[in-house]
Amino acid sequence: LVVTPPGPELVLNVSSTFVLTCSGSAPVVWERMSQEPPQEMAKAQDGTFSSVLTLTNLTGLDTGEYFCTHNDSRGLETDERKRLYIFVPDPTVGFLPNDAEELFIFLTEITEITIPCRVTDPQLVVTLHEKKGDVALPVPYDHQRGFSGIFEDRSYICKTTIGDREVDSDAYYVYRLQVSSINVSVNAVQTVVRQGENITLMCIVIGNEVVNFEWTYPRKESGRLVEPVTDFLLDMPYHIRSILHIPSAELEDSGTYTCNVTESVNDHQDEKAINITVVESGYVRLLGEVGTLQFAELHRSRTLQVVFEAYPPPTVLWFKDNRTLGDSSAGEIALSTRNVSETRYVSELTLVRVKVAEAGHYTMRAFHEDAEVQLSFQLQINVPVRVLELSESHPDSGEQTVRCRGRGMPQPNIIWSACRDLKRCPRELPPTLLGNSSEEESQLETNVTYWEEEQEFEVVSTLRLQHVDRPLSVRCTLRNAVGQDTQEVIVVPHSLPFKV
């Protein structure tokens, strides 16, 4: 929106004419005191829309806010609005007239308010006084709005001097009402019940002595009324409670229960709603997924978590290899099931400093008289690899062999590498990988065994070296998902009389 003149504040002469032009990409309109004064709607050559407000024969009563806004703000991205404030200094108008309701200012809390005494001339000095006092109060004044501050329950007037006469405004009355705003809370003994069980809801309002409760609930819509009971909580002042009790719930009692509270002094009201679900029978439902294969690292702690929904509260059992688990006195296993909301549960199995023997088939079972659910997974204990043996030998065939043996879980990979230049390798030169089938210098033979008892893999790899003509550093590296280990041995030629 483009406004000419742009303002934001104009001072105009009494009896003069003044034109305000507003243009925009959609139809625009001038507003004054929430009304549209007579104005010319027009369209410019460039296709923009304009509205021209011609103010003629201006008087002090034309002082105030003028807004330009889009005629129909629907569909426009911003509900843009341009504000102009016009002063028309007029010695015949003292304070601008107020509506009757502006003279009575009601408060229900300590808050800043504005006493809206306004003048037509921004140059006038305006002061605020208690109605029966001469002393000017130290409250800031805005010529466009009035005096703003925190006021006590008193009567106030504004004063100004126009020419040589003192002018008083109407009296403004500030009243602070000691009525609490209504704050309602609604809760239910249970928001999920089985058919045949009871629904009990409580609606509590605080800080008021006289209130009226009105309940809305599914049964009411079908004409079956339930009489609520209202009582005062004597241990807490101004706590009033309404109890709605529905015995032997039916499926049709599912839905929204609303408590509406009104107080008649100030016609305040508040309402809160709660949803109740009546189920045919109880249920247990798993939330989220737990993979059928879980991992834990040897000697580390591991918590396995299952989230589920249930009503009524279920019994939860954990099994390992079909044997029931319980909290161990040695603190190696901890079981806990906690209620995180009315019908949501988290069950946790914590294995402290995991041992190999704790690998196996685990099951969590949650059940009550109406339903049950179970979840199973295999727990694999991951063991970091370690090289247990690296040895070199000279069989009669003339070749030289290096044997590497190691263990870990999951199955380790073996990598053989060698350094021919002992001075520079491996710091300066990278080691050469060995065991490639294309290379005739070396042959590799690897065997893998799974040890059921220890629940880990053993890898034995033999490297055959055809001819070693100078000392060679041979390195065996074992790797798996949880670590790696390396050992090395120096292999010397047959011809040399020493071996490192």
Partner: nanobody
Framework: EVQLVESGGGLVQAGGSLRLSCAAS????????MGWFRQAPGKQRALVAI???????VYTNSVEGRFTMSRDSAKNMVYLQMTSLEPEDTAVYYC???????????WGQGTQVTVSS
Amino acid sequence: EVQLVESGGGLVQAGGSLRLSCAASESISSIEQMGWFRQAPGKQRALVAINTYGGRTVYTNSVEGRFTMSRDSAKNMVYLQMTSLEPEDTAVYYCYAQTTAWRGGVWGQGTQVTVSS
């Protein structure tokens, strides 16, 4: 404060043309809004066209496409070219100028335009 003098009015037949001129007593280059209004017998003074400081000219719907307003700052003149005149265009035409600093608008004395059928 500027003074405005209109000229160019007269009697013309329906469908004819007239060009109104408005001479300003001082520079119009800094004047925020200049325009033309008209007052028909027994009616309120109403907008015909207004040219804002940014150069945009706005016409009332009844004259759009028939009237063209222009502003010649070098000569301190404002013009209203009126074509396809209709009997309903009969009125006293006033030149108008406005700047915020003046705290109001300034009118010329008016020029009579009569369109006969």
